[in-house]
Interface confidence: low
């Protein structure tokens, strides 16, 4: 259906509150450096304009495309050239090039300081004084730090955030109530951001086909009772939703996501028995609930895969006459039977099956050639299983911090050219896989671990793409989405690396270290560990253990000293000298 005014259509569909929130998010993701007040003003003006168009669709400019309207609005920002440099050149372009230009300037690592919450009393006063402004600030702060955040999901988290304050600001001990709830929400938000960045990277770097394959596997695991037609329909719609959000079309994305939730709820009988509770909720909670819904039980009478994919004499005909449908069916049938496999593994198996058919269907006797194809999957399945087993054992032995350090050493040796902050950030996140997945039952471990690793390694790829320094990282990131993790796992020590010159400044510490929260203290120590390795890449695990132990003792000693700063300036150089001697 064609609408006279696209902006009026979206305003009517989404309602004023969600419309305004999404516009604020869109602007904050594009112009990440602008102050909150400027964005509030822009969002207010766009919302007022949309409201006017909803009342009179043939009003002036109401027929313009959303990209034109939003782009024109962004280009009115006075400080564009000062704050964003060459991003201002985007305004010289016409649509759709102008929007593509804005998208290309999104910064995945804007370097804003971490959000520090003020005192609970001040927070509650701000919340009670102007709830709308308070939640707008939350949307703004998250959106500018995470320019690819899944916008409709951010509206949901803002609603959760509101709920936390509504509850905790009434509590006797506000701090005790707010602390754990805000932290739990923070963890969810960070994971959500990373997951959506992975989806956007899949679409942008590897195309619709890669994203659709990923989604077919995931949804077939979750909804094994749904038939392939139903899975295909949901995947097609879901692809459109994520393409829109990744492309900055947040109003269309949120609207289409709501439509998809509506469709799933209207057709739950042919999708999953687990959707009922979700479908009774309002739109934001409904979509979120559907995205997180538990797996349905497998149908009891699933026949062997071999009948259709190995034993059937028509396999090559089926494959050659409609390759994507046939491979999609294979992926669907395999995934619904294997909820315990990671999506990445399922996609590798489908790729292996495809390669086998490409080879075998060109021979004189295809059935003999592909007869053992399912047996040939074994090494592909064993590899992540063994990896998870080995790493979970290491995690259980070392704990999260120790496991992070082991990964830090491993990854610094693989790619020592990568910047220290990136190596620390990524290794710390990789280390969290232990806490997140190793306590799960055997049947859920691989899926949890490998799919989480894919999301974290995507962060490494995104950061590295901004300033590429390692050919091997570029290779692992760009050759194959499903083989990224095995590619990184397979990297050995980079023998071509020339050690970094020693810089005493890097290993100089001050008394402010003592007052840092535990996590930030760990980051400081881990930064030193990476720098040490870049200086002495041949250091053994034993040597590093000794030096890190000494370093921990040094920090403890100086933080307990009467004259902390004096202790750091006196003992620090001694520690560095001892470390250098130990690592010869």
């Amino acid at each position: 259906e064609a609408y006279k005014s696209e902006i009026a259509h979206r305003y009517n569909d989404l309602g004023e509150e969600h419309f305004r929130g999404l516009v604020l998010v869109a602007f904050s993701q594009y112009l990440q450096q602008c102050p909150f007040e400027d964005h509030v003003k822009l969002a207010k003006e766009v919302t007022e304009f949309a409201k006017a168009c909803a009342a009179e669709e043939s009003g002036a400019n109401c027929d313009k495309s959303l990209h034109t309207l939003f782009g024109d609005k962004l280009c009115t920002v006075a400080s564009l050239r000062d704050k964003y440099g060459d991003m201002a050149d985007c305004c010289e372009k016409q649509e759709p090039d102008r929007n593509e230009c804005f998208l290309a300037h999104k910064d995945d690592n804007p370097g804003f300081p971490p959000l520090v919450a003020p005192e609970p009393d001040a927070l509650c006063a701000a919340f009670q004084d102007n709830e709308q402004l308070f939640l707008g600030k939350y949307l703004y702060e998250i959106a500018r730090r995470h320019p690819y955040f899944y916008a409709p999901e951010l509206l949901y988290y803002a609603q959760q955030y509101k709920g936390v304050f509504a509850e905790c600001c009434q509590a006797a001990d506000k701090a005790a109530c707010l602390g754990p709830k805000i932290e739990a929400l923070r963890e969810k938000v960070l994971l959500s951001s990373a997951k959506e960045r992975f989806k956007c990277a899949s679409l942008q770097k590897f195309g619709d086909r890669a994203f659709k394959a990923w989604s077919v596997a995931r949804l077939s695991q979750r909804f094994p009772k749904a038939d392939f037609a139903e899975i295909s329909k949901v995947v097609t719609d879901l692809t459109k939703v994520h393409k829109e959000c990744c492309h900055g079309d947040l109003l269309e994305c949120a609207d289409d996501r709501a439509d998809l939730a509506k469709y799933m709820c209207e057709n739950q009988d042919s999708i999953s028995t687990k959707l009922k509770e979700c479908c009774d909720k309002p739109v934001l909670e409904k979509s979120q609930c559907l995205a997180e819904v538990e797996r349905d039980e497998l149908p009891g009478d699933l026949p062997s895969l071999a009948a259709d994919f190995v034993e059937d004499k028509e396999v090559c005909k089926n494959y050659q006459e409609a390759k994507d449908v046939f491979l999609g069916t294979f992926l669907y049938e395999y995934a619904r039977r294997h909820p315990e496999y990671s999506v990445s593994l399922l996609l590798r198996l489908a790729k292996e099956y495809e390669a086998t058919l490409e080879k075998c269907c060109a021979t004189d006797d295809p059935p003999t050639c592909y007869a053992k194809v399912l047996d040939e999957f074994k090494p592909l399945v064993d590899e992540p299983q063994n990896l998870v087993k080995t790493n979970c054992e290491l995690f259980e032995k070392l704990g999260e911090y120790g496991f992070q350090n082991a990964l830090l050493v491993r990854y610094t040796k693989k790619a020592p050219q990568v910047s220290t902050p990136t190596l620390v950030e990524v290794s710390r996140k990789l280390g969290k896989v232990g806490t997140k997945c190793c306590k799960k039952p055997e049947s859920e471990r691989m899926s949890c671990a490998e799919d989480f690793l894919s999301v974290v390694l995507n962060r490494l790829c995104v950061l590295h793409e901004k300033t590429p320094v390692s050919e091997r990282v570029t290779k692992c990131c760009s050759e194959s989405l499903v083989n990224r993790r095995p590619c990184f796992s397979g990297l050995e020590v980079d023998e071509t690396y020339v050690p970094k010159e020693f810089n005493a400044e890097t290993f100089t510490f001050h008394a402010d270290l003592c007052t840092l929260p535990e996590a930030e203290k760990q980051v400081k120590k881990q930064t030193a560990l990476v720098e040490l390795l870049k200086h002495k890449p041949k250091a053994t695990d034993e040597q590093l253990k000794t030096v890190m132990g000494d370093f921990g003792a040094f920090v403890e000693k100086c933080c307990a000293a009467e004259n902390k700063e004096g202790c750091f300036s006196e003992e620090g150089p001694k520690l560095v000298a001892a470390a250098q001697a130990a690592l010869v």
């Epitope: 392939f228 037609a229 005909k317 006459e321």
Partner: nanobody, 126 residues
């Protein structure tokens, strides 16, 4: 749920023709892999012809290739089997079977089809 209802069977002389129909309800037939099977007295049920779900790719048993044609009319939600040059050995009860899903595979394994019609009798005799 898919309900299937066959019609068009009857008595025909060798060399003659018949057209079987299978009306589907409860699901669009173009999104369903559908097939015709037959069962002669005292014999196993056997695959005759099939057509994929979401793709018009057809399959035939060697014994009927060149004589039988499977097709569907999406607007009428109906599957057809045009049978020409009929032989006495084609005598059997013909069943329509459905396997929902946009899959081009029309398996020849009867057990893989969850939905079946009640059958229509075809007798080829002089």
């Amino acid at each position: 749920e898919v309900q299937l209802l066959e019609s068009g069977g009857g008595l025909v002389q060798p060399g003659g023709s018949l057209r079987l129909s299978c009306a589907a309800s409860g699901r669009y037939i173009d999104e369903t892999a559908v097939a015709w099977f037959r069962q002669a007295p005292g014999k196993e049920r056997e695959f005759v012809a099939g057509i994929g779900g979401g793709v018009d790719i057809t399959y035939y048993a060697d014994s009927v290739k060149g004589r039988f044609t499977i097709s569907r009319d999406n607007s009428k939600n109906t599957l057809y089997l045009q049978m020409n040059s009929l032989r006495p050995e084609d005598t059997a009860v013909y069943y329509c079977a459905a396997r929902p899903g946009r899959q081009l595979i029309t398996s020849k394994v009867a057990d893989l089809y969850p939905y079946w019609g009640q059958g229509t009798l075809v007798t080829v005799s002089s």
